[in-house]
């Protein structure tokens, strides 16, 4: 059993190294920014509109292209739920330092959890996506 798990871990590791998760990251960031733009305001301060909608984000064409490429990548993890979870964790880790607000972080996590389902894949049952709040700047 241990031997099997070790092989599974190795296989997952090499799958993760081969995978290009950037389209997923691009799709998710565009999605949460588009949602915020469409509300047109920071929900926490009703008197202040932090952003005005961007024509690029409003179009959404780039995002659906990213989603398609993202789903193709995630498809590789379909038969390994634990590895799928690790892929989602890696996406969260890669973007955590871009999210400097609690609301943005929670929304990103929500969309990330829904990602496998959006791709018509099984979502991992238990997958901890917690990172240090506010992310870390990585160089």
């Amino acid at each position: 059993r241990q031997q099997w798990e070790l092989q599974g871990d190795r296989r997952c590791q090499s799958q993760l190294e081969r995978a290009n998760l950037r389209p997923c990251e691009q799709h998710l960031m565009q999605k949460i920014q588009r949602d915020e733009d469409s509300y047109g305001r920071d929900p926490y301060s009703p008197s202040q509109d932090p952003y005005s909608p961007s024509p690029y984000d409003r179009r959404g064409a780039g995002s659906s292209q990213h989603q398609e490429r993202c789903c193709n990548e995630l498809n590789e993890f379909e038969n390994n739920q634990r590895c799928m979870c690790e892929a989602l964790q890696q996406i969260m880790e890669n973007q955590s330092d871009r999210l400097q607000g609690r609301q943005q972080e929670q929304q990103f996590k929500r969309e990330l959890r829904n990602l496998p389902q959006q791709c018509g894949l099984r979502a991992p049952q238990r997958c901890d996506l917690e990172v240090e709040s506010g992310g870390r700047d990585r160089y």
């Epitope: 998710l28 920071d42 709040s133």
Partner: antibody, heavy 118, light 111 residues
């Protein structure tokens, strides 16, 4: 409406310390990264430090690393900047600013002047 | 560290005429998520800085549409299609890819 009010500035001698405060109201203070930025006549705007909403992560400009400490008190909606070993080149107007959530500096205070002079 | 370089440092303008400011970074500001982490700020005389443009080309709310941002990678431009008297002040670009760094500023004044 959104208000960020800095205080604690003043005239201080080189090598001494000063503690700046920034009181926030009308914003979700505890849900965003907060920053300190300074403006001096010779250098323009210079980002100084930032602290994540949970207070776990702190970031500093190289010019202040090891001398300045950023912190926040969530219960009082207040941001702090402890400035030790002050130098003449730290003379500036210090602003606190709230992050947009995507690394832009969205809301700014009116600033407090710090003068380091012998 | 990323170094931000603005030009020109001083820009005399005529109301009604266009104006543009250039900003160059010492390394690409494109994150793996596809966004350029470059903002533009304006500090009017006697006021605190204000956000004009974020992520290279998105206009912050309340900012007149005569302001536009463009560019990608290491080269960015802020354009004012028709300068108005109230646009005077110091304009700064700022990178937010690795921590945060401002350019030296461009002082815009009426001729």
């Amino acid at each position: 409406q959104v208000q960020l009010v800095e205080s604690g500035g003043g005239v201080v001698q080189p090598g001494r310390s000063l503690r700046l405060s920034c009181a926030a109201s009308g914003i979700a203070f505890n849900d965003y990264t907060m920053h300190w930025v300074r403006r001096s006549p010779d250098k323009g705007l210079e980002w100084v430090a930032a602290i994540s909403y949970g207070g776990t992560n702190k970031y500093y400009a190289d010019s202040v690393k090891g001398r300045f400490t950023i912190s926040r008190d969530s219960s009082k909606n207040t941001l702090f900047l402890q400035m030790d070993s002050l130098r003449v080149e730290d003379t500036a107007v210090y602003y606190c600013a709230r992050d947009s959530g995507y690394r832009s500096l969205l809301h700014w205070g009116q600033g407090t002047l710090v003068t380091v002079s012998s | 560290d990323i170094v931000m370089t603005q030009s020109p440092l001083s820009l005399p303008v005529t109301p009604g005429e266009p104006a543009s400011i250039s900003c160059r970074s010492s390394q690409s500001l494109v994150h793996r998520n596809g966004y350029n982490y470059l903002d533009w700020y304006l500090q009017k005389p006697g006021q605190s800085p204000q956000l004009l443009i974020y992520m290279a080309s998105k206009r912050a709310s309340g900012v007149p549409d005569r302001f536009s941002g463009s560019g990608s990678g290491t080269d960015f431009t802020l354009k004012i299609s028709r300068v108005e008297a109230e646009d005077v002040g110091v304009y700064y670009c700022m990178q937010a890819l690795q921590t945060w760094t401002f350019g030296q500023g461009t002082k815009v004044e009426i001729k």
